[in-house]
């Protein structure tokens, strides 16, 4: 978990801080959204359960050329124990519904905030 705070992290980041930083970034995305996020790109919906971070990254990494979510993609890579590349779907067990990136971010944010409030940081 050493890279979760971005490139300037001085050392290991506590899991609670890493999760908080991810929540903050998603809040910023949703609050600063003026035009459709990522031009209305669609991504695979995910199950917000075990393996959620890798699944979220696998879904979002297929969105290219969207600077608004680049930091989120980097942060999610710190939560996912394996390397994820575009077109990889090992954690996306069910690929049957596509939703807009904006809705994906909102759903993910709600779930992460619940985990944070419950004290589930890992």
């Amino acid at each position: 978990l050493t890279c979760l705070g971005g490139f300037a992290s001085p050392g290991p980041v506590p899991p609670s801080t890493a999760l908080r930083e991810l929540i903050e970034e998603l809040v910023n995305i949703t609050q600063n959204q003026k035009a459709p996020l990522c031009n209305g790109s669609m991504v695979w919906s995910i199950n917000l359960t075990a393996g959620m971070y890798c699944a979220a990254l696998e879904s979002l990494i297929n969105v290219s050329g969207c600077s608004a979510i680049e930091k989120t993609q980097r942060m999610l890579s710190g939560f996912c124990p394996h390397k994820v590349s575009a077109g990889q779907f090992s954690s996306l067990h069910v690929r049957d519904t596509k939703i807009e990136v904006a809705q994906f971010v909102k759903d993910l944010l709600l779930h992460l905030k619940k985990l944070f409030r419950e004290g589930q940081f890992n």
Epitope: T17, E24, V27, Q31, K113, K114, R117, E118
Partner: antibody, heavy 123, light 107 residues
């Protein structure tokens, strides 16, 4: 207008269970992002956070008192109840309930407080 | 638990003076620092949240600053109605913890 009102027994005997009720006005604990905290303040001393409960029934406690505390809510009455078991004279304090909101970042800032209820633990 | 240390524990200043109260956390709290004002016999009132943000109705003479472990509450021009005890509180990590308070009096 947002208001919180605490009610309690005033006097409790050592070893008994203290039950405090916080009634909420002007907002509902069934609304997303709403939470209620309990804080206490011994006479002439500082503030100590005890517990909180969120709209979706997520509960958190101060580890130092966790084994003695239970927080719950009754959405139909718009009330939050705190129980503190095995009370001791050191639990003598003014007990406050306060509202917290998590609409954006989770600040854990208490923006509205009740007037407080003084509880004395004595035989 | 994160320890919050406030200084000074009390101060006396004249009306119109600039007053600063310090709060130090035992570890980085990432700006999750809130300030409360408690007047004698009353409940605390939220003055500042997230280091520098103000709820509606808080006078402009109150401001907050800081980062990492060190935070400051400033009253730019002390008024008689500012006689109170001021508490800092960290909201970064549970359990939530408060500073010991700073009692502000008028000279």
């Amino acid at each position: 207008e947002v208001t919180l009102r605490e009610s309690g027994p005033g006097l409790v005997k050592p070893t008994q269970t203290l039950t405090l009720t916080c009634t909420l006005y002007g907002f509902s604990l069934s609304t997303s992002d709403m939470g209620v905290d309990w804080i206490r303040q011994p006479p002439g001393k500082g503030l100590e956070w005890l517990a909180h409960i969120w709209w979706d029934d997520v509960k958190r406690y101060n580890p130092a008192l966790k084994s003695r505390l239970t927080i719950s809510k009754d959405t139909s009455k718009n009330q939050v109840v705190l129980k503190l078991t095995s009370v001791d004279p050191v639990d003598t304090a003014t007990y406050y309930c306060a509202r917290t909101v998590s609409s954006g970042y989770i600040y854990y800032a208490m923006d509205y407080w009740g007037q407080g209820t003084l509880v004395t633990v004595s035989s | 638990d994160i320890q919050m240390t406030q200084s000074p524990s009390s101060l006396s200043a004249s009306v119109g003076d600039r007053v600063t109260i310090s709060c130090r956390a035992s570890q980085d709290i990432r700006n999750y620092l809130n300030w409360y004002q408690q007047k004698p016999g009353k409940a605390p009132k939220l003055l500042i949240f997230y280091t520098s943000m103000k709820p509606r109705g808080v006078p402009s003479r109150f401001s907050g600053s800081g980062s990492g472990t060190d935070y400051t509450l400033t009253i730019s021009s002390l008024q008689p109605e500012d006689i109170a005890t001021y508490y800092c509180q960290q909201g970064n990590t549970l359990p939530l913890t408060f500073g010991g308070g700073t009692k502000v009096e008028i000279k």
